[in-house]
């Protein structure tokens, strides 16, 4: 099966979970967190790619056609690489230097050429854009998208792990 | 939306303490951090203080630490600043800011009215 059809279901999800793993590591929520109610104009906020019921990553929508799901992910992987590139997360205060931040984006990067179909142009998408930050607002902004990331990356490995349980092929023992 | 209404402004001489209040009504369900920000007449608005709503960690301006003290009450939804060591250059309108967390790249959305604080010498 080409790689555009079908990715290695299992290798991604060993990553999504170890991508879940870091964000979690770079960002462990303490106390109580306010679980956010999924409004309807949630979506227009930064352009934030959220995975909907319309991506088709439900088991039905996966089994027909996996490509539009995997779009939907690649896309948030993108969007998130592009904030940690950012000076949110380069400038001051520095991150400690056994911060899990550069693994964990070196594991967005590598999941997101895993995704990369081999015969595809890559997608062009809308960023959001980013004025430079101040020093005070960015252990803000950090906390903000590491938690929206963790959200992302907790259904994406939910993904993965029904691709991988469902369809990887099966392989056909040769005579 | 969320609305923040602040209290606790007033006159004080230098050296003195005061004690803001800011309560969240609304939405604060969005909320991921309360901020103090202050105006000087003739100056821009600048950042004092800031406390994470789950956490509680927080964050100050140099000009205000070690003097300023940002806390909350979660129950209350309300954030608190109690200014202790006051100068006269620490005058101005407090606003009290709220920042929401579904919004990624920016920060405080809400603002309060604001309250007077006035240090004499």
């Known amino acids: 099966v080409p790689r555009s059809s079908s990715p290695d279901w299992a290798q991604c999800q060993q990553l999504s979970r170890n991508l879940c793993m870091l964000a979690w590591n770079a960002h462990a929520p303490a106390g109580h967190m306010n679980l956010l109610r999924e409004e309807e104009d949630e979506e227009t906020k930064n352009n934030v790619p959220r995975i909907q019921c319309e991506d088709g990553c439900d088991p039905q929508g996966l089994k027909d056609n996996s490509q539009f799901c995997l779009q939907r992910i690649r896309q948030g992987l993108a969007f998130y690489k592009h904030l940690l590139d950012s000076d949110i997360f380069k400038g001051e205060p520095a991150l400690l230097p056994d911060s899990p931040m550069e693994q964990l984006h070196t594991s967005l990067l590598g999941l997101s050429q895993l995704l990369q179909p081999e015969d595809h142009p890559r997608e062009t998408q809308q960023m959001p854009s980013l004025s430079s930050s101040q020093q005070w607002q960015r252990p803000l902004l950090r906390s903000k998208i590491l938690r929206s990331l963790q959200a992302f990356l907790a259904i994406a490995a939910r993904v993965f792990a029904h691709g991988a349980a469902t369809l990887t092929e099966p392989l056909v023992p040769t005579a | 939306e969320v609305q923040l209404v602040e209290s606790g402004g007033g006159l004080v001489q230098a050296g003195g303490s005061l004690r803001l209040s800011c309560a969240a009504s609304?939405?604060?369900?969005?909320?991921?951090?309360m901020g103090w920000f202050r105006q000087a007449p003739g100056k821009e608005r600048e950042f004092v203080a800031h406390?994470?709503?789950?956490?509680?960690?927080?964050y100050y301006a140099d000009s205000v630490k070690g003097r300023f003290a940002i806390s909350r009450d979660n129950a209350k939804n309300t954030v608190y600043l109690q200014m202790n060591s006051l100068k006269p250059e620490d005058t101005a309108v407090y606003y009290c800011?709220?920042?929401?967390?579904?919004?990624?790249?920016?920060?405080?959305?809400?603002w309060g009215q604001g309250t007077q604080v006035t240090v004499s010498s």
């Open positions: 406390i994470s709503w789950s956490g509680g960690s927080t």
């Open positions: 800011a709220a920042d929401d967390m579904r919004e990624l790249v920016t920060t405080f959305h809400y």
């Open positions: 609304g939405q604060t369900f969005s909320i991921h951090a």
